[in-house]
Interface confidence: medium
């Protein structure tokens, strides 16, 4: 399964459109590049959109994309691409990386529910071994772009609602 | 502080298995990725494969597939990596190390000598 | 996989000395390019992550430049603990790789 690159900082250029899979982008000997979430079919002699096949088992060119994407789809889920996984925010609130920020955090805002070592935590009831508090400081927020926490992934407004819909 | 504490020098012959733990500490465990990486003799560091937190699922290298399982233990924090049809050329120092979240390895293990030799 | 080159391979220096160790990658990764120390025995450090962050703890006379495919960790002067094995890895796409090494040595 092929790898979803990330956008670089400052605008994309045409080394990322090209390597955005870097192992799955080229399908056939034409070895055409398509633009970032499209792929190149050898029969139709275009590129195409991989929201298109991302039902089609049999089709691997998206394969990294169409995980990303029914990924971001997931509430409290978002995508890893040095780890090329989902992961799950729910599982890991308390010491948790930046992208899982707006889950855990409303997560907390409404302790219903919530597993009895998250309720302890937000009552200060649990020891204080985590070491991550400032972890993000000196991160900057770059508009669109996700921080290095979600390293390179360009996201839309409505992407960002897909992450944390 | 965080800490990760590895098992002694293991020596094997070709055909058996290793298995290395890597006990941590100074964070919760299971919020945190864990990574096994190699070092041969004169090589560079070699990413093995990963398990994730909270529902042990795994990656491996396609280099090591077939081979190499890494598994978990949550009670006891910690983390295994064990590398089945042992070769002389797996002779190498093996690192735990944990996964930040943002593209590095944040923290390592001490290194677990495996030599493998008739 | 994406390749990781650095250069060189070993460097001899002296107490005081400014050095600088390069890291090229075979296809464009941004900044998502980490440096490691490591020293005989002991377990690898992460120096710099994303290019030019200090990890917690590592002192100021290290830093981090680059963009793209071509990256510098630069030591501003040599201290006796700093000779040591550095390495750098990307951090951009799956599965992480890691340059060959640059092993510093005292002249």
């Known amino acids: 399964m092929s790898g979803l690159g990330r956008s670089r900082r400052g605008g994309r250029s045409r080394v990322d459109q090209e390597e955005r899979f870097p192992q799955g982008l080229w399908t056939g000997v034409a070895m055409r590049s398509c633009p970032e979430e499209q792929y190149w079919d050898p029969l139709l002699g275009t590129c195409m959109s991989c929201k298109t096949i991302c039902n089609h088992q049999s089709q691997r060119t998206c394969a990294a994309f169409c995980r990303s994407l029914s990924c971001r789809k997931e509430q409290g889920k978002f995508y890893d691409h040095l780890l090329r996984d989902c992961i799950s925010c729910a599982s890991i609130c308390g010491q948790h990386p930046k992208q899982c920020a707006y889950f855990c955090e409303n997560k907390l805002r409404s302790p219903v529910n919530l597993p009895p070592e998250l309720r302890r935590q937000r009552s200060g009831e649990v020891e204080n071994n985590s070491d991550n508090s400032g972890r993000y400081q000196g991160l900057e927020h770059r508009g669109s772009e996700a921080s290095p926490a979600l390293p390179g992934l360009k996201l839309s407004a409505d992407q960002v609602a897909l992450v944390y819909s | 502080q965080v800490q990760l504490v590895q098992s002694g020098a293991e020596v094997k012959k070709p055909g058996a298995s290793v298995k290395v733990s890597c006990k941590a500490s100074?964070?919760?465990?299971?919020?945190?990725?864990m990574h096994w990486v190699r070092q041969a003799p004169g090589q560079r560091l070699e990413w093995m494969g990963y398990i994730l937190p909270y529902n042990d699922g795994t990656k491996y290298s396609q280099k090591f597939q077939g081979r190499v399982t890494i598994t978990r233990d949550t009670s006891a924090s910690t983390a295994y990596m064990e590398l089945s049809s042992l070769r002389s050329e797996d002779t190498a120092v093996y690192y735990c190390?944990?996964?930040?979240?943002?593209?590095?390895?944040?923290?390592w293990g001490q290194g677990t000598t495996v030599t493998v030799s008739s | 996989d994406i390749q990781m080159t650095q250069s060189p391979s070993s460097l001899s220096a002296s107490v005081g000395d400014r050095v600088t160790i390069t890291c090229r990658a075979s296809?464009?990764?941004?900044?998502?390019l980490n440096w490691y120390q490591q020293k005989p025995g002991k377990a690898v450090k992460l120096l710099m992550r994303?290019?030019?962050r200090l990890h917690s703890g590592v002192p100021s006379r290290f830093s981090g430049s680059g963009s793209g495919t071509d990256f510098t960790l630069t030591i501003s002067s040599l201290q006796p603990e700093d000779f040591a094995t550095y390495y750098c890895?990307?951090?951009?796409?799956?599965?992480?790789?890691f340059g060959g090494g640059t092993k510093l040595e005292i002249k």
């Open positions: 296809q464009d990764i941004g900044n998502y």
């Open positions: 890895q990307q951090g951009f796409t799956f599965p992480p790789t």
């Open positions: 994303y290019t030019s």
């Open positions: 100074g964070y919760t465990f299971t919020n945190y990725v």
């Open positions: 190390a944990r996964y930040d979240w943002e593209g590095s390895f944040d923290y």
